[in-house]
Each structure stands twice: as structure tokens, then as C-alpha cells.
């Protein structure tokens, strides 16, 4: 799996989409988990409705929501009021029994609001550190991360 980068602005909402084969994953619940670094385990944040037929209903855990379009084959995660600590690696997963298939690996980056002049502290400004070579990553736009790339607009 390549890693797809989604960037959002602090304080705003970020939508992450995970496309999948609706036939292959028919009848399976989905989940959104946070990876503890690239090498660490993936800890469940939120999962779709216990009844697969009701997967279209939005479920929340704190500021994170999940909804599944099972016919169209798109899992959507919404991170509301994005904060610096929301940045990191995540996975969209398809659940079957105690197993989980990875649908997409996601890197969430939180950018500083250029209009917010308060102490930026833990926030990142594009171009402040190592950045993609010859790449333009817009806020809330995703792109795939190639092996060896460090996707810094961020500084950490």
C-alpha cells in the first residue's frame, strides 16, 4: 500500500476518503485506526455501525466521524476541528471476523491557519522544512507518498 497524504488546516474539518471494491468487501464493516508510528500497531478510533446495512449512518468518536457508502464503495472519515495532535498515520480497514484488511494508508498533516496570528506552537507551515521534491500539495488535497519521500511541509 502506498500512503496517501491528506492535509487540513488547524481548526477546520478534514475529510478523508477511502475507495474500495464494493463487491469484494460486501457485508463487511469498516474501521478507522491510528498507527503508532510507521512501525507501531494500529489503534481503533471509530468503526461503522454494528449492522452493516446501517453503515451509511454517521458514527462519531469524539471529533472523528465515519460513514460508509457500501454501494459506491467509498468510506469517508471526517476529522472535525483539526488539531496538531491529529496529525499522523492512519488506516482505513475492512473488518472480517477478528481480521482487518487495509483499504488505504493515510498520512494526515495539520497545517497552520495563515490567518490565525496566535502562537503557532505545534503547527506546521508549508515550506518550513524538508518538502516533497517538485510537488505541490494543497490543503485538503490528497496525493500518494512514494517510498523514501518525507512529506514535510511540516517541520516535525
Amino acid at each position: 500500500h502506498n500512503t496517501t497524504v491528506f492535509q487540513g488546516v488547524a481548526g477546520q474539518s478534514l475529510q478523508v476518503s477511502c475507495p474500495y471494491d464494493s463487491m469484494k468487501h460486501w457485508g463487511r464493516r469498516k474501521a478507522w485506526c491510528r498507527q503508532l508510528g510507521e512501525k507501531g500497531p494500529c489503534q481503533r478510533v471509530v468503526s461503522t455501525h454494528n449492522l452493516w446495512l446501517l453503515s451509511f449512518l454517521r458514527r462519531w468518536n469524539g471529533s472523528t466521524a465515519i460513514t460508509d457508502d457500501t454501494l459506491g464503495g467509498t468510506l469517508t472519515i471526517t476529522l472535525r476541528n483539526l488539531q496538531p495532535h491529529d496529525a499522523g498515520l492512519y488506516q482505513c480497514q475492512s473488518l472480517h471476523g477478528s481480521e482487518a484488511d487495509t483499504l488505504r494508508k493515510v498520512l494526515v498533516e495539520v497545517l497552520a491557519d495563515p490567518l490565525d496570528h496566535r502562537d503557532a506552537g505545534d503547527l506546521w507551515f508549508p515550506g518550513e522544512s524538508e518538502s516533497f521534491e517538485d510537488a505541490h500539495v494543497e490543503h485538503s488535497i490528497s496525493r500518494s507518498l512514494l517510498e523514501g519521500e518525507i512529506p514535510f511541509p511540516p517541520t516535525s
Partner: antibody
Amino acid sequence: QVQLQQSGAEVVKPGASVKMSCKTSGYPFSNFWITWVKQRPGQGLVWIGDIYPGSDNRNFNERFKTKATLTVDTSSSTAYMHLSSLTSEDSAVYFCAREAYYTNPGFAYWGQGTLVTVSA
Amino acid sequence: DVVMTQTPLSLPVSLGDQASISCRSSQTIIHSNGNTYLEWYLRKPGQSPKLLIYKVSNRFCGVPDRFSGSGSGTDFTLKISRVEAEDLGVYYCFQGSHVPYTFGGGTELEIK
């Protein structure tokens, strides 16, 4: 910018214990693994263990499992290492380090080191 | 534990020469996620170690392109194409794929 500031040098007696700190700044503390590394005078680097502040997950080198205790205080963005039952073998410089980025676990950011001297 | 064996122990070079350091692991160091977490660090006297190479061959930001990493399986190499005075110090390979993570014994790069 990312910074890791370690506590000052310690001189302790054999059998005693010591707790050193690694105060971080410039990034979301909960999001990155903190690693501890030992270097004795004239010797190589030894990986002690690491801790993930956001969940308290830890990995350890078995050699240090009864020697070192790793903890964090998220309110002050500080990692701690407690060393117990000190002997001359524990005289060393201890470093804390942080991984470079979510997609690069290499230790890119290091503290300046804490020198521990065990002496009667 | 994975044992990382570095050779040579000491490497005398003239400035401008190429230097090559070898690192051999006692078993393959491919993580369960498919990545090989082989890194190279330089420690100069009185300084903290500095990350040079990660995931076998990726240069960390700010590291000059005269440094290159290569290898696979159990055999890895760090090459410095033209040694400069600021490159002197002790080089360590490191595997971060299998706990406990382990460093090589170090190779001292010194002036001939």
C-alpha cells in the same frame, strides 16, 4: 523547531537510583516515539527502549527491563528514564531521541545527553 | 537479538578519498510491514549522534549527497564519495526492524 533538552549530569552512589528527564518542544509530544540510548565511555551505542507518549506503548531491550523505567508526562511534554540499583556498569551518557517523521522512524532529533557517573 | 557487525573497526583515509563501511546483520531485517529499517548515524566527539541514512538508502534532509547507502538482506554499505574533514567521527549502523533494536559496534573514520 523540534528540541529535546535533557537534565544535567548526575553523580550517584552504587545501589542508588537516578531519574533523568528529556523535555521536548516544537511538536505534538503525543505523536512521536521517544527512544533512549546508552553510551559508555569508549564504547558503542546501545538501544535501551522506547515509549509512545500518546498511548504509553513501550518496547524494551531485555537487558534493561529491570534496570530502566520509561515514563512520560504529557502535560509538560517530558519523557523520563529512571535507572535503579546503579553499578559502575551504568556509568554512561544517556541520550533521548525522537523519530524524524511519521514516515521516517530514524532518530533525527537528539537531546544533548545526560552523563551519569556511579561512584562511591 | 539481531547482531549488527560493522567492518572495519577503524578506517584511515585521506581527505578526498572514497570511504566504504560495511554492516552485516545476523538475520534479515525486514519489518512485518515490508520495510527494511536500516539506518546510519555519525557521532562526532562531544556531539549527539546525527542521522545520515534511513531505510537503507534514503539520505536524511541536509545530508550531503556524497553519502550513500545501499544493500539488502543482511549486507549493507555506507559510502562516502569524497571524504571531508567534517566527516570524521564514529559511524554506526542500526537496525530498527526487530525488537530489541540494535546498533553496530561502530567504525571510526580517521585521517591517514
